[in-house]
């Protein structure tokens, strides 16, 4: 009976995600058969989040909208380890929008999910950010410094990275 009700709950949770994510890849968390964590196929997973590299070229606003219709946000990078994971799936000759912007052009950077902007956990290329008209952040590769962040005009189309919490069923 307990297993039956658990299965029913799982099915109803899966139905919620079905519209945008017809297929999920799930792994068993720990030793308990009851706990499964899932990411939409073909998203990648790291710690408690799922990531998707969007290869369509869009402005920052539309990139965020694209993520949101999938139940995600543009990526918020919280640690060096997270960035190191993300860059494994990026192409060196492309740039990708992050969920970081400075809407007022006053160097008050903010993350899309309201995570406080912490200057100590930022990975700007040297000399960046450098322009008040460039109010959105990208991650890109520079041969001298490898992967880092740069500010760019928000209307210039770029690829992007979406991030969502893992789905627990």
């Amino acid at each position: 009976n307990f297993m039956y009700s658990k299965t029913v709950k799982r099915l109803s949770k899966l139905r919620e995600y079905q519209q945008y994510h017809p297929s999920l890849t799930c792994v068993m968390e720990g030793k308990d058969i009851e706990d499964w964590s899932c990411c939409p196929t073909p998203w990648t997973s790291f710690q408690s989040s799922c990531y998707f590299i969007s290869t369509g070229m869009q402005s920052w606003t539309k990139s965020q909208k694209n993520c949101s219709v999938m139940g995600a946000d543009l990526v918020v990078i919280n640690t060096r380890e997270e960035q190191d994971f993300i860059i494994q799936n990026l192409k060196r000759n492309s740039s990708y929008f992050l969920g970081l912007s400075d809407p007022g052009g006053r160097r008050h950077w903010q993350w899309v999910d309201q995570t406080p902007y912490n200057e100590n956990v930022t990975f700007w290329h040297s000399g960046e950010p450098n322009n008040l008209d460039e109010r959105c952040a990208i991650i890109n590769f520079r041969s001298s410094e490898e992967w880092g962040w740069n500010d760019i005009h928000c209307h210039v189309p770029q690829k992007s990275i979406c991030k969502m919490k893992k789905i627990y069923i």
Partner: antibody, heavy 118, light 107 residues
Framework: QVQLVQSGAEVKKPGASVKVSCKAS????????IHWVRQAPGQGLEWMGT????????SYNQKFKGRVTMTRDTSTSTVYMELSSLRSEDTAVYYC???????????WGQGTLVTVSS | DIQMTQSPSSLSASVGDRVTITCRAS??????LAWYQQKPGKAPKLLLY???TLAEGVPSRFSGSGSGTDYTLTISSLQPEDFATYYC?????????FGGGTKVEIK
């Protein structure tokens, strides 16, 4: 007032290159991105790509990749669109357009007719 | 790439008529759609953006509606200066493709 003034008509031979200019005035040049759109005679409109005058960042329509180059000169508030390896199908009016804050083309240049003929 | 299919390609109408032009996208463009008016020898002029927002200085007889993949431009009462070609354009992702155009002619 905002104005985009383009260079004059050009006649080119197949295989040659053409460089069209678009001089902006009436606003802060580096604050708005510029797009290029073309229109073949009696035909519809085709988006070619965009350039950000501040940093020089570009994004091109894959159809033209390798043949189109967009550049800018901030000292004269001018953007340029160069199209190489011209063929007769490139005969068209080429427009520059400014993308406004609402992310749509709010101001257009008057157009530059490029004729490719042997 | 998202394709934009506009219909009809041409129509004949009289002054005072109500005119409707439709634009269908090959994918969801989330209302990121503009409508332009173009007269011979001139650059296109922005009429509406975000599918239904009137651009500055555009008469209120022009209106837009739609969502997802299907959008409409309506001219409630056609005026002599409205005889022109109309184009839709999406701004969801590059390339920002245009519809094929609708030529509105005098009946």
């Amino acid at each position: 007032q905002v104005q985009l003034v383009q260079s004059g008509a050009e006649v080119k031979k197949p295989g040659a290159s053409v460089k069209v200019s678009c001089k902006a005035s009436g606003y802060t040049f580096t604050s708005y991105i510029i797009h290029w759109v073309r229109q073949a005679p009696g035909q519809g409109l085709e988006w070619m790509g965009t350039i950000y005058p501040g940093g020089g960042d570009t994004s091109y329509n894959q159809k033209f990749k390798g043949r189109v180059t967009m550049t800018r000169d901030t000292s004269t508030s001018t953007v340029y669109m160069e199209l190489s390896s011209l063929r007769s199908e490139d005969t068209a009016v080429y427009y520059c357009a400014r993308m406004g804050d609402n992310e749509y083309f709010d101001y257009w240049g008057q157009g530059t007719l490029v004729t490719v003929s042997s | 790439d998202i394709q934009m299919t506009q219909s009809p390609s041409s129509l004949s109408a009289s002054v005072g008529d109500r005119v409707t032009i439709t634009c269908r996208a090959s994918g969801n463009i989330h209302n990121y759609l503009a409508w332009y008016q173009q007269k011979p020898g001139k650059a296109p002029k922005l009429l509406l953006y975000d599918a239904e927002t009137l651009a500055e200085g555009v008469p209120s007889r022009f209106s837009g509606s739609g969502s997802g993949t299907d959008y409409t431009l309506t001219i409630s009462s056609l005026q002599p200066e409205d005889f022109a070609t109309y184009y839709c354009q999406h701004f969801w992702s590059t390339p920002y493709t245009f519809g094929g155009g609708t030529k509105v002619e005098i009946k």
